[in-house]
Amino acid sequence: SSPTSSASSFSSSAPFLASAVSAQPPLPDQCPALCECSEAARTVKCVNRNLTEVPTDLPAYVRNLFLTGNQLAVLPAGAFARRPPLAELAALNLSGSRLDEVRAGAFEHLPSLRQLDLSHNPLADLSPFAFSGSNASVSAPSPLVELILNHIVPPEDERQNRSFEGMVVAALLAGRALQGLRRLELASNHFLYLPRDVLAQLPSLRHLDLSNNSLVSLTYVSFRNLTHLESLHLEDNALKVLHNGTLAELQGLPHIRVFLDNNPWVCDCHMADMVTWLKETEVVQGKDRLTCAYPEKMRNRVLLELNSADLDCDPILPPSLQTS
């Protein structure tokens, strides 16, 4: 969570000051041009300044760094590597900065980095080693606890010839560096599926946000190992039904709260188990709001109010009786 401090506690650097000292080593704890700094709050804000690269002269005290609303385009390896290192930097917000490429090792030499927000950047090229820093099969553990990657999907014409889901998951799993990750937000990314291995390798997750994607099914996803998971956001997807295996896994998680609003539930015979479960489970939040989308005759019916007689499937006609 970002600190709040009054604007008056921030000092701004005038551009002419920056140019006046550019030939010399940066003064200790000076404020970069186009940024606002508060040593008391350990915060630097370089917001909506159309910066094209990360300032080189960030003060060593910085704990919270906001670089939002810029035009960074590329985050190279060691983008935040400094001498001495930014040893205190714990929260880094790069949202809405037109990043389309994050290279391997972009966040290296940030030993205290716990929160990283890359949301609202069209990441056409996210290196598999963006967070792990190396291509070793097992990397040094990342200090990251929160990783916010909401709406990082690029426009369709800018996507490379590979699965966007696969690219993101590769970065999450590389070197098993994110074993300590507790919060992962992947909302609004047009995900069609969740690769089956991703959750098994993020055992420390407490909060997982997959809302506003295009997930149709969770059949091949296992939540079993996420024994610390407290909240699972699946609102605004394309889920049609949850099957018994998924229901049992969710039901068994000791801390879980599940959010399922605004999915196009198909209320046919395959929905019977889920309705039975919903009537008794306490883990689904706002379960009384869940309604059918299909078939047409069931549209807007409340799932909790359905009984087995409501949930039928049209008989499948043998080929000889089917009409075109």
Epitope: Q251, G252, H255, R257, E282
Partner: antibody, heavy 122, light 111 residues
Framework: EVQLVESGGGLVQPGGSLRLSCAAS????????MSWVRQAPGKGLEWVGF??????????ENSASVKGRFTISRDNSKSSLYLQMNSLKTEDTAVYYC?????????????WGQGTLVTVSS | DIVLTQSPLSLPVTPGEPASISCRAS??????????LQWYLQKPGQSPQLLIY???NVESGVPDRFSGSGSGTDFTLKISRVEAEDIGVYFC?????????FGGGTKVEIK
Amino acid sequence: EVQLVESGGGLVQPGGSLRLSCAASGFTFTDYYMSWVRQAPGKGLEWVGFIRNKGNGYTTENSASVKGRFTISRDNSKSSLYLQMNSLKTEDTAVYYCARYRGNPHYAMDYWGQGTLVTVSS
Amino acid sequence: DIVLTQSPLSLPVTPGEPASISCRASESVEFYGTSFLQWYLQKPGQSPQLLIYGASNVESGVPDRFSGSGSGTDFTLKISRVEAEDIGVYFCQQSRKVPSTFGGGTKVEIK
């Protein structure tokens, strides 16, 4: 650190009323179901009821033995849980515990307060 | 309501020796693959503390000499080597159905 502190117990006559409070701290109060459990002197534990979390509309469930007489409520701005007890009977004499349900409430209570004694006697 | 029957009512134990308590439910407490059966210990003058949840999961901070087993209707709490601090009343509880119910308790005391 999770803490639950009950207050409001005391001596009350049969037919009288009493309101118990439970002050909670150390966790996000609105995320959790909260409950009351009682224990008559020298006896076992009896579940009184619970109140659901924000996601499930703060609705309540009570045991048959107190239904219509006891009301569970919460003030989320104060992180406080309440038990309003009306039409008290001598058999309501007990230590009343406030308890927090685990995140998945099917696994029941993981933290308990120290209890407050309610004595119903003429 | 689901009735939980604990046995024995009283259990005299010798420190260092194992101990076992049984809890039987009048109907299954299983729901979608998990048995929602907990074990609590109430030490003298204290409030109950959670030992085991979901029949077999040991609560964080609870010594590993405690273990739980069973499914459906029959459950067991085991203490591998009883210590003096383990004395008190042990309760099982089901949270499969409302109302939640408790067993009558088993008093564990040193011989």
